[in-house]
Interface confidence: low
Amino acid sequence: AVDLTLLANLRLTDPQRFFLTCVSGEAGAGRGSDAWGPPLLLEKDDRIVRTPPGPPLRLARNGSHQVTLRGFSKPSDLVGVFSCVGGAGARRTRVIYVHNSPGAHLLPDKVTHTVNKGDTAVLSARVHKEKQTDVIWKSNGSYFYTLDWHEAQDGRFLLQLPNVQPPSSGIYSATYLEASPLGSAFFRLIVRGCGAGRWGPGCTKECPGCLHGGVCHDHDGECVCPPGFTGTRCEQACREGRFGQSCQEQCPGISGCRGLTFCLPDPYGCSCGSGWRGSQCQEACAPGHFGADCRLQCQCQNGGTCDRFSGCVCPSGWHGVHCEKSDRIPQILNMASELEFNLETMPRINCAAAGNPFPVRGSIELRKPDGTVLLSTKAIVEPEKTTAEFEVPRLVLADSGFWECRVSTSGGQDSRRFKVNVKVPPVPLAAPRLLTKQSRQLVVSPLVSFSGDGPISTVRLHYRPQDSTMDWSTIVVDPSENVTLMNLRPKTGYSVRVQLSRPGEGGEGAWGPPTLMTTDCPEPLLQPWLEGWHVEGTDRLRVSWSLPLVPGPLVGDGFLLRLWDGTRGQERRENVSSPQARTALLTGLTPGTHYQLDVQLYHCTLLGPASPPAHVLLPPSGPPAPRHLHAQALSDSEIQLTWKHPEALPGPISKYVVEVQVAGGAGDPLWIDVDRPEETSTIIRGLNASTRYLFRMRASIQGLGDWSNTVEESTLGNGLQAEGPVQESRAAEEGLDQ
């Protein structure tokens, strides 16, 4: 959980002395744009509890990890919800404090309620100043429940919430009807996302068993420890007056944490500091009680005494929560005799120990050969052992030698020496060698002599065009094999460098010296010839060609087709990017144009000899579309089409073509010729009864023209299935052209 604490100073006699402080123990917290993370935010949240507007509150940033809110002028300024937001990225966390007016009509018996999913939550509002009106309960500012004033039990109004779920979380309030909202009792309900003792996405994981009132976080399984306790299971008490995940913060003032409310990230909520209780956290724990809100009982055995801040203080030879366990000499477990790391890495070294009392994080240390002592940054506590994790500073060669892990408890000491070998990542002393080159690839021998330590685990080849600022391309290869760099640009110089790695984290060495390798590009020598061409429309031409058969691979990247329009003095170039291609469709040509055509092979930027030219005449463009096409059903098998001739014809029409298709049908359309171009009407026969058809038509002069609009018409019913549609124009039957 994020190390974030919101402290409320409850010296309520003078609101001007009231302050809220948000303290972050996170690295770089609160420094905003000039550091690692976003700043701490501390503000009053007026979304649910609104108070009369007053002078703006003052925010003071006390250093890098603390922000304080002051400037409260009257008691009503204090009432409501305050929040502090800290942490960066996915760790951004909001801590909430709810402040009740001590002069309110209703006061909460307990402000923060943390319950598990499925539990029953009971909120209790104590009558402080009685009014004989209904009590309204609200949830997050919205009406929730009403109680009659007679329903008070023992001077309290209770709200029972059975089978609570996470969406039930939020701010609850109990208010006398027609009373000022500032006289409400405000509560905070936190519902963990899992049942008791469980955490994780499906609540399948078991909580570590948080001690001293710590609460298991339902997302990450970590214990959120009460103020004044630390450790992965909150097993360790801080010194009096200290708080924060590592006990690194100190309560301000001479009276320590007296009069302070501490709010921590959910699902903990708020409480007094360790050793204090009461609505204003100004009462010391009664004898035999300790911890936050004095909620814990000591029950010390074997002569232990109860300290209200830390619990049982055990006499020599005893330990445990209740001094119930006798001491045993600690022992370091399963320490490897030799470890290997790479130079300048920052490895994590684990050291596990068992014993009685159980070793905690601070009791295990790591000693380097130069005598420097490292303290662990993290500890994993298991039933049979504690594993301390050490973050080792950047390793230097002098760190090679014998290191020592040492554990010390009141039960005694143990230590284990182990050898650390610091290895130097390999650095190539020479550039890689070029073995062969082609137009688009280079074959390279990567393994060269190197300084530093082996064995070589991977070889990386970095390459990019010479004088380029683009990113380097990288290929990872087997140390024993030659490398082929593919998909290169022909006739281009490449800067090539080797990087060697040895096993382990940080085993990558520096890049070796660069060398220049240049790709090849021989001139294509083969002359293609044009085999044929076919006019596929007024502006489309399909061309085919061949190449002479020669032994060996084809030297070429593709073909260039050139069309010369002598009339207009224009050249059209068409690139065919496959050297295997032997045909191409040229589109978008000018109808009725005479073209000279040739083809040549190209390689890189070099062109081979051109084929002997061919001369092609494209037909002129077709006529415009017929106008006003109309369809009319005559019978169950006949539909009559009528139209008007196209306008602005470039010459006499040779025929019309009608296209017939069943509406919604998946089959190919049928084309029917109307060979008497002077006609403006025709009958399509042999159609199916009760069937919807689509028709369109176009005219032909030397080439086919544009299609007309499409018309739709259905044949009449009750006919037999026809053989297929045919056309009749003025009693003259026409053939079917599919």
Epitope: G28, A60, G63, Q248
Partner: antibody
Framework: EVQLLESGGGLVQPGGSLRLSCAAS????????MAWVRQAPGKGLEWVSV????????YYADSVKGRFTISRDNSKNTLYLQMNSLRAEDTAVYYC??????????WGQGTLVTVSS | DIQMTQSPATLSVSPGERATLSCRAS??????LAWYQQKPGQAPRLLIY???NRATGIPARFSGSGSGTDFTLTISSLEPEDFAVYYC?????????FGGGTKVEIK
């Protein structure tokens, strides 16, 4: 009794470097924010730099940012000020002080730094 | 930056008289203000913190008042050892800033 004892001052040429030290005793050094304050001859007090107990947070006056580095060694109860690229205007008595939340409650006797060619 | 302006620059007072020193902040600093006394050749000494709280061992004749932007240090009856330079300092915001000082000299 709280005591702060500065050392390391002296004469240095412009562009030179100097490292000041402050030995602390009589209180739990690792719990407190520490600072350096300087006073040019015949002038007022100017805050230079501050460092938080863990050493993880530091602040500098604009006039020294990028040239001075404050650090601490809690195991040795010692505060340091590494001064690089020194200028004539850095000539001053440098005081080591303890920052008690809002105020400097204890001061050392000061060490004189003279930057001159 | 918060500017701290002290007035007057020099105050001439006879022993036994009352001295009133003023310090003004360029923006509100609540009560985050301290007063220091400095004698020639010596380090400064804390007198008042949080605008009005006397530091340990400081005589009762020294008192501080004010909040927001205007603050006052009062020496009710000057003793011979009180003639010195007095500085105010704010801790409301970074950078920490001192006033230019008020020299209290014997009239």
């Amino acid at each position: 009794e709280v005591q702060l004892l500065e050392s390391g001052g002296g004469l240095v040429q412009p562009g030179g470097s100097l490292r000041l030290s402050c030995a602390a005793s009589g209180f739990t050094f690792s719990n407190y924010v520490m600072a350096w304050v300087r006073q040019a001859p015949g002038k007022g007090l100017e805050w230079v730099s501050v460092i938080y107990p863990s050493g993880g947070a530091t602040y500098y006056a604009d006039s020294v940012k990028g040239r001075f580095t404050i650090s601490r060694d809690n195991s040795k109860n010692t505060l340091y000020l590494q001064m690089n690229s020194l200028r004539a205007e850095d000539t001053a008595v440098y005081y080591c002080t303890r920052l008690a939340v809002t105020h400097f409650d204890y001061w050392g006797q000061g060490t004189l730094v003279t930057v001159s060619s | 930056d918060i500017q701290m302006t002290q007035s007057p620059a020099t105050l001439s007072v006879s022993p036994g008289e009352r001295a009133t020193l003023s310090c003004r902040a360029s923006q509100s600093i609540s009560s985050s203000l301290a007063w220091y006394q400095q004698k020639p050749g010596q380090a400064p000494r804390l007198l008042i913190y949080d605008a009005s709280n006397r530091a340990t061992g400081i005589p009762a004749r020294f008192s501080g008042s004010g909040s927001g932007t205007d603050f006052t240090l009062t020496i009710s009856s000057l003793e011979p050892e009180d003639f010195a330079v007095y500085y105010c300092q704010q801790r409301s915001n970074w950078p920490l800033t001192f006033g230019g000082g008020t020299k209290v000299e014997i009239k």
